[in-house]
């Protein structure tokens, strides 16, 4: 099926006892009001984690929490939630997030592997990359489409829910 | 290829009770929800309930709780329906379907055939 | 719950003839309509979901169309492996719900 962004109407948001869900998929709080990482399905009648449609695409409902999801699995790269973006940490070490200190610090050690601006940084020649905002700019770019399908899905423990195998 | 293997007919007695499977292949079973719909003879499909199976989650049509228990194995990538305290009303084909979360069923079983009879 | 009404129980028509089968909805379903074929022996495929989105596999000729309470479903150019019960299911609300079925039969 291809991506439908849907907002169902109707929906019912009963549940009775008996019916289980142990994960706390089902809130028991009204239609589509839903905790965060989670989507209202109107079919099944109760609350799904966004990482069960992450493989699928029909995922314009998480399309955020997705984007996220693969940006996190690649290495050197975070996702900034206010710019709903995946973001390369080599275009911002100097300026960088905690998100990147990792990455940044490894790569200020070994200079070798640094990009030219970097280098340059490292001997004096600071290139100011930051807005007046104090955020970066430089950015890798990668829009709605940096969703793929994630295949062999591996999750942190922090992340509730699902793990694929 | 996705597949949903369903188990074979039955013929049980009234009073008793069934469990039936449905083991799929091709797709990650526990990443997908599963449900299990009624046909009696001649008429229309009744949607019984569905499960999750990676956490065992499961909601009923009014109609068949009590009747139905939805149970899966991950390890196997097999759901279950058991059917308890049969009646000759519980003789019907159920089918197992794969939610495709797009508010449809894509992928069938074959169905099993129930019979009711003393 | 919401009720699916498919008013032509059967259908007789020739090879080669454009056929169409209705299925109302007792209320607004948006485009939340999917319609399943169910062939004599029992096995059972998604068409079509969304109104008019083909499933994969599902041959062109099969088309689908309409909005809100009112749904059709085309097959413009008949062959025999199409006789078959067609059945719509609303995917708009829980619980799902289906139509009772067209049977459709080579006149």
């Known amino acids: 099926m291809s991506g439908l962004g849907r907002s169902r109407r109707g929906g019912r948001s009963r549940v009775d006892q008996e019916e289980r869900f142990p994960q706390g998929l089902w809130t028991g709080v009204a239609m589509r009001s839903c905790p965060e990482e989670q989507y209202w399905d109107p079919l099944l009648g109760t609350c799904m984690s966004c990482k069960t449609i992450c493989n699928h695409q029909s995922q314009r409902t998480c399309a955020a929490f997705c984007r996220s999801l693969s940006c996190r699995k690649e290495q050197g790269k975070f996702y900034d939630h206010l710019l709903r973006d995946c973001i390369s940490c080599a275009s911002i070490c100097g300026q960088h997030p905690k998100q990147c200190a990792y990455f940044c610090e490894n790569k200020l050690r070994s200079p070798v592997n640094l990009p030219p601006e970097l280098r340059r940084q490292r001997s004096g020649e600071v290139e100011n990359n930051s807005d007046n905002s104090g955020r970066y700019q430089g950015l890798e770019h990668r829009g709605s489409e940096a969703s793929p399908a994630l295949p062999g899905l591996k999750l942190s423990a922090d992340q509730v829910a699902l793990v694929y195998s | 290829e996705v597949q949903l293997q369903q188990s074979g007919p039955e013929l049980v007695k009234p009073g008793s009770s069934v469990k039936m499977s449905c083991k799929a292949s091709?797709?990650?079973?526990?990443?997908?929800?599963m449900h299990w719909v009624k046909q009696k003879p001649g008429q229309g499909l009744e949607w019984i309930g569905y499960i999750l199976p990676y956490n065992d989650g499961t909601k009923y049509n009014e109609k068949f709780k009590g009747k139905a228990t939805l149970t899966s194995d991950k390890s196997s990538s097999t759901a279950y329906m058991e059917f308890s305290v049969l009646t000759s009303e519980d003789s019907a084909v159920y089918y197992c379907?794969?939610?495709?979360?797009?508010?449809?069923?894509?992928?069938w079983g074959q169905g099993t055939a129930l019979t009711v009879s003393s | 719950d919401i009720q699916m009404t498919q008013t032509t129980s059967s259908l007789s028509a020739s090879l080669g003839d454009r056929v169409t089968i209705s299925c109302r909805a007792s209320?607004?379903?948006?485009?939340?309509l999917n319609w399943y074929q169910q062939k004599p022996d029992g096995t059972v495929k998604l068409l079509m979901c969304y109104t008019s989105r083909l499933h994969s596999g599902v041959p062109s000729r099969f088309s689908g169309s309409g909005s809100g309470t009112d749904f059709s479903l085309t097959i413009s150019n008949l062959e025999q492996e199409d006789i078959a019960t067609y059945f719509c299911?609303?995917?708009?609300?829980?619980?799902?719900?289906f139509g009772g079925g067209t049977k459709l039969e080579i006149k």
């Open positions: 299911q609303q995917g708009n609300t829980f619980p799902p719900t």
């Open positions: 209320q607004d379903i948006s485009n939340y």
């Open positions: 379907a794969r939610y495709d979360y797009e508010g449809s069923f894509d992928y």
């Open positions: 091709g797709y990650t079973f526990t990443n997908y929800v």
